[in-house]
């Protein structure tokens, strides 16, 4: 947020950009939590996002019996390698096709066992509210799935019907990493020592980090014809004074006519 | 990338024989898999027999067991398959079907790289 300054008091308000402001020979480059001229003032929101998607990712392992592990399994970029990549990506693509958030998969390392396929099974999801629960009910499809397809894709007489065949035993989960995002503690941390005054309010699903100086949420502060500003002490009314009315109170709710005070001062004088 | 040409096929009497060939190139490696595939009219792909070319397995379909002869010449990169007692029913397609892999899958969608095929009919 910038404010820019003409004429001779320029260089003054140079050096006296205030919250780590910097003069850049105009005005003001204020941090993201300030603007005014001086960066003397807090913003009432600040962005948080969120991501467009939150991702998860699984650790898995299966056996692959149809196919006989060589040593050219180890080399990423061997032709063996490259085409036992394609094979499985396909057959997974099958078992998950019926996930809408399942995205593919990635092997990480192929070693003997008939071929043990350490790979990562990739979610992804839209960004709602409850990104977690539809992650968590992935990630329980997706189990189910693998349990599933390498329970039945078995070799019969040592020999595989299938795209691929399994050893049943060979499938486990080994972990689970689902992207975090927290849109609570994203707004505390950017609001930095404003921390405590900042709140997320959702609407649309989507997160907003306010504070009470913010209108139109449901904790907006209401300062009637004042101004509404952050201190460290949170947030307060400033209070205007008309050419007909002083206004006071904690939301400046209080108008005193000044003819009345003017008329009672002149009745003592 | 892997290439397949085919050749051998053409019309025979039934009891008759005939032998297909193969001709490979693209590998990197001289260790891999090679198979015949057939498709009669109207009829799924179907495994006839399959050979890894380093001579650990080869497998025959239960319906050309004990006529059909499955071989590998490594020296000239080359798959044939000789085809003796050739029956009505062995009318088909032949495909020539390899994988860099040694596979042990008699499913057609296992095997990347395809022929043109060479067609084989048995018919008095």
């Known amino acids: 947020r910038t404010t820019t300054c003409f004429g001779d008091g320029c260089q003054n308000t140079a050096s006296r950009c205030k919250n780590g402001g910097t003069w850049d020979g105009l005005k003001c480059q204020c941090p993201n939590l300030y603007y005014g001229e001086l960066c003397e003032e807090v913003v009432s929101s600040i962005d948080i996002g969120p991501p467009e998607t939150i991702s998860a990712q699984m650790e898995l392992t299966v056996t692959v019996t149809s196919v006989k592990f060589t040593e050219e399994l180890k080399n990423h970029s061997s032709q063996e390698f490259q085409e036992f990549k394609q094979t499985f990506t396909e057959q997974m693509n099958i078992v998950y096709s019926g996930i809408p958030e399942y995205v593919g998969v990635n092997i990480t390392k192929l070693r003997l066992g008939s071929v043990v396929v350490e790979h990562d099974v990739l979610l992804r999801t839209k960004y709602t509210p409850e990104y977690k629960t539809v992650l968590d009910n992935a990630t329980e499809v997706v189990k189910e799935k693998i349990t599933k397809v390498t329970t039945q894709q078995i070799m019969i007489n040592d020999i595989c019907s299938d795209m691929m065949c399994f050893n049943t035993t060979g499938t486990q989960v080994q972990n689970i990493t689902v992207t975090q995002y927290d849109p609570e503690e994203d707004c505390r941390k950017m609001a930095k020592e404003y921390g405590d005054y900042f709140v997320v309010e959702y609407r649309d699903q989507k997160p907003y980090c306010i504070s009470p100086c913010e209108p139109g949420f449901s904790v907006s502060k209401n300062c009637n014809l004042g101004k509404c500003q952050m201190s460290l002490s949170g947030p307060q009314c400033l209070c205007v004074t008309t050419e007909t009315h002083w206004y006071s109170g904690e939301t400046c709710n209080q108008g005193t006519q000044k003819s009345l005070v003017y008329g009672h001062h002149h009745h003592h004088h | 990338d892997v290439q397949l040409v085919e050749s051998g096929g053409g019309v025979v009497q039934p009891g008759g024989s005939l032998r297909l060939s193969c001709a490979a190139s693209g590998y990197t490696s001289n260790r891999y898999s090679m198979a015949w595939f057939r498709q009669a009219p109207g009829k799924e792909r179907e495994v006839v027999a399959f050979?890894?070319?380093?001579?650990?397995?080869?497998y025959y379909a239960d319906s050309v067991k004990g006529r059909f002869t499955i071989s590998h010449d490594n020296s000239k990169n080359t798959l044939y398959l000789q085809m003796n007692s050739l029956r009505a029913e062995d009318t088909a397609v032949y495909y020539c079907?390899?994988?860099?892999?040694?596979?042990?899958?008699?499913?057609?969608?296992?095997?990347?790289?395809w022929g043109q095929g060479t067609m084989v009919t048995v018919s008095s």
């Open positions: 050979i890894w070319t380093d001579g650990g397995r080869t």
């Open positions: 079907a390899a994988s860099s892999l040694l596979l042990q899958t008699i499913n057609p969608r296992a095997w990347p790289y």
